[in-house]
């Protein structure tokens, strides 16, 4: 079940999510949580026409969770 090229997938559709409806993948803890538990979006920079992307600022190696600083709120899809 090989998926199509990554670049096309990224351009044509939002990132897939492994979560059930009403839950979102939290990049801070790296599992699905109720979407309402996610951190609020960062304020968008002055002059920006779209919200600043929410990405994880996570170290490349870790022995514990909690090192990230943001969450990506992608609600579960049916």
């Amino acid at each position: 079940m090989r998926r199509g090229p990554r670049s096309l997938r990224g351009r044509d559709a939002p990132a897939p999510t492994p979560c059930v409806p009403a839950e979102c993948f939290d990049l801070l803890v790296r599992h699905c949580v109720a979407c309402g538990l996610l951190r609020t979006p960062r304020p968008k920079p002055a002059g920006a026409s779209s919200p600043a992307p929410r990405t994880a600022l996570q170290p490349q190696e870790s022995v514990g969770a909690g090192a990230g600083e943001a969450a990506l709120p992608l609600p579960g899809l049916l």
């Epitope: 990132a15 897939p16 492994p18 790296r30 699905c32 996570q58 022995v63 969770a65």
Partner: antibody, heavy 118, light 107 residues
Framework: QVTLKESGPGILQPSQTLSLTCSFS??????????VGWIRQPSGKGLEWLAH???????YYNPALKSRLTISKDTSKNQVFLKIANVDTADTATYYC??????????WGQGTALTVSS | DIQMTQSPSSLSASLGERVSLTCRAS??????LNWLQQEPDGTIRRLIY???RLDSGVPKRFSGSRSGSEYSLTISSLESEDFVDYYC?????????FGGGTKLEIE
């Protein structure tokens, strides 16, 4: 259909480095929120989580073993690797890899046995 | 690290009986708990995710629940293939940790 399969040397001598490969199909580690991890089980004992790696190359290690562990991936080949340095008889176990999604480990490999013996 | 204390370590029961296995978490893990089943040949499969959600293909006689820091796997009516090993796994925080396992044996 998601499948994972572990491969390893089977037997090592103490102080050698263990190299394990997890080959998988049915998903891609370039997909958002996908991860692959390693777990081991000494014969007759319980399961122990070792390490896992996420689609974005973020890695987590068991603190008790971190100094000896290295996890990596080859996304294009659908493979994840684990190296354990300086093995000892206490590392004799069956080693499993598993897929991680949003709710822990959802698919598991069949396991590969390792014996460390001089 | 979060400790998962699983009980009992072994359990003898009869066909058709209702049994419950429990795991107690040493810290708050919310609903981030799996129940896993391991066959004698080593095959592992997930039965329950997020404390109480049944994986596809898992018989309805399996169910999961939570009361505070205690998590339970209940099998409503034991069948012959259920007499294997069971583990809980918390994935709330790294390092992920397992319960010590329960060996379910036929009486």
């Amino acid at each position: 259909q998601v499948t994972l399969k572990e491969s390893g040397p089977g037997i090592l001598q103490p102080s050698q480095t263990l190299s394990l490969t997890c080959s998988f199909s049915g998903f891609s580690l370039s997909t958002f929120a996908m991860g692959v991890g390693w777990i081991r089980q000494p014969s007759g004992k319980g399961l122990e989580w070792l390490a896992h790696i996420w689609w974005d190359d973020v890695k987590y290690y068991n603190p008790a073993l971190k100094s000896r562990l290295t996890i990596s991936k080859d996304t294009s080949k659908n493979q994840v690797f684990l190296k354990i340095a300086n093995v000892d008889t206490a590392d004799t176990a069956t080693y499993y890899c598993g897929r991680i999604g949003g709710y822990g480990f959802d698919y598991w490999g069949q396991g590969t046995a390792l014996t460390v013996s001089s | 690290d979060i400790q998962m204390t699983q009980s009992p370590s072994s359990l003898s029961a009869s066909l058709g009986e209702r049994v419950s296995l429990t795991c107690r978490a040493s810290q708050d893990i919310g609903s981030s708990l799996n129940w896993l089943q391991q066959e004698p040949d080593g095959t592992i499969r997930r039965l329950i995710y997020a404390t109480s959600r049944l994986d596809s293909g898992v018989p309805k006689r399996f169910s999961g629940s939570r009361s505070g820091s205690e998590y339970s796997l209940t099998i409503s009516s034991l069948e012959s293939e259920d007499f294997v090993d069971y583990y809980c796994l918390q994935y709330a925080n790294s390092p992920y940790t397992f319960g010590g396992g329960t060996k379910l044996e036929i009486e």
